[in-house]
C-alpha cells in the first residue's frame, strides 16, 4: 500500500530528525498529502523558510555558530516581504543581529551562506552603515523610520535571528 | 558532538594525486554535510568543495574544478577529497567540517556555515 509506505518513511524521518528538534510542526502542502513541510516548533514559517528569535544575547560569531548547530544560519534577507514578516516577531526595544557582515572592514557586505549582496534590496537605516570598524549588521527599531539595519561592532552581544529551509517529510 | 579527523596529507610532486580523508564520529554522520576548506600560510582560510549530505549534490571553488572530487561513504561515516593534478599553489593545510542539515540536497559554502571543524591534514606540493 503506497500510503502505509510513505506514512512508515514519515515516521521514520521524524524519528531521525527528533534529537535534532524534539517537535515539528507540519503542514500538507497543496492537495498532494504526499508533501508535509515542517518547521521545529516554535519556530514560525514563512514561505519556504522556518525562522527563530534568539533572546540570548552573543556576539555575531557565537549566535551563527548558535544557529548553524540547529542546521540554520543567521537570517538573510532577500525581500522587503520577507523583513515584514521577521518584523512581526521583534520586539521594538531590542536589536538582533543578521546573518551579514563586512569582515575585511571595506564594505565589502557577505551574506553568511554566501547569497549575492544585492545594494537594491537593502533596508539600512538613513546614514548607515556608517563606521568601518563595525562589521556586523543587525535590525532594531527607530521610531522615525521603523525597522531597518544598521552595522555595529561584532563582538557586542545582541539578540538573534536564525533562518533554516522547511524540512520536507 | 561530532569529531573529526582528516588524514592523507603530504608531500607530493606538481602534476601527483591525493586523496584526503575525513573520518567522523560522534553522531549520525548522514545528518550532515560535509565541506573541504584549506589555509596557505598567510593567507586566509577558503573553502574548496562541498557536498549535500545525501552526496547528490557538490560545488567547488573555480581554481579546483575539473580537478579535485568531492565524495561521501554515508555507511563508513567518512568523507573524501580527491586531489588530482596538484598544482604548487594548492600547498595548504586541508579541513574537513560538518554541518547539521535537513536539506538532502544543499551543499554549502560558506566557512561560517560549518560548526564542526577537524584539526587539518598539511598537503605540500613541490614543483
Known amino acids: 500500500n503506497f500510503m502505509y509506505s510513505k506514512t512508515v518513511k514519515r515516521l521514520s524521518k521524524l524519528r531521525e530528525y527528533q534529537q535534532y528538534h524534539p517537535s515539528l510542526t507540519c503542514v500538507m502542502e497543496g492537495k498532494d498529502i504526499e508533501d508535509w513541510s515542517c518547521c521545529p516548533t516554535p519556530w514560525t514559517s514563512f514561505q519556504s523558510s522556518c525562522y527563530f528569535i534568539s533572546t540570548g544575547m552573543q556576539s555575531w560569531t557565537k549566535s551563527q555558530k548558535n544557529c548553524s548547530v540547529m542546521g540554520a544560519d543567521l537570517v538573510v534577507i532577500n525581500t522587503r516581504e520577507e523583513q515584514d514578516f521577521i518584523i512581526q516577531n521583534l520586539k521594538r526595544n531590542s536589536s538582533y543581529f543578521l546573518g551579514l557582515s563586512d569582515p575585511g572592514g571595506r564594505r565589502h557586505w557577505q551574506w553568511v551562506d554566501q547569497t549575492p549582496y544585492n545594494e537594491n534590496v537593502t533596508f539600512w537605516h538613513s546614514g548607515e552603515p556608517n563606521n568601518l570598524d563595525e562589521r556586523c549588521a543587525i535590525i532594531n527599531f527607530r521610531s522615525s523610520e521603523e525597522w531597518g539595519w544598521n552595522d555595529i561592532h561584532c563582538h557586542v552581544p545582541q539578540k538573534s535571528i536564525c533562518k533554516m529551509k522547511k524540512i520536507y517529510i | 558532538q561530532v569529531q573529526l579527523q582528516e588524514s592523507g596529507g603530504g608531500l607530493v610532486q606538481a602534476g601527483d594525486s591525493l586523496r584526503l580523508s575525513c573520518a567522523a564520529s560522534?553522531?549520525?554522520?548522514?545528518?550532515?554535510?560535509m565541506g573541504w576548506f584549506r589555509q596557505a600560510p598567510g593567507k586566509e582560510r577558503e573553502f574548496v568543495a562541498a557536498i549535500s549530505r545525501s552526496g547528490g549534490s557538490t560545488d567547488y571553488r573555480d581554481s579546483v574544478k575539473g580537478r579535485f572530487t568531492i565524495s561521501r561513504d554515508n555507511d563508513l561515516n567518512a568523507g573524501y577529497l580527491q586531489m588530482n593534478s596538484l598544482k604548487p599553489e594548492d600547498t595548504a593545510v586541508y579541513y574537513c567540517a560538518l554541518r547539521l542539515t535537513f536539506s538532502t540536497t544543499t551543499a554549502y559554502t560558506g566557512e561560517l556555515q560549518y560548526p564542526y571543524w577537524g584539526q587539518g591534514t598539511q598537503v605540500t606540493v613541490s614543483s
Open positions: 560522534g553522531d549520525t554522520f548522514s545528518m550532515y554535510a
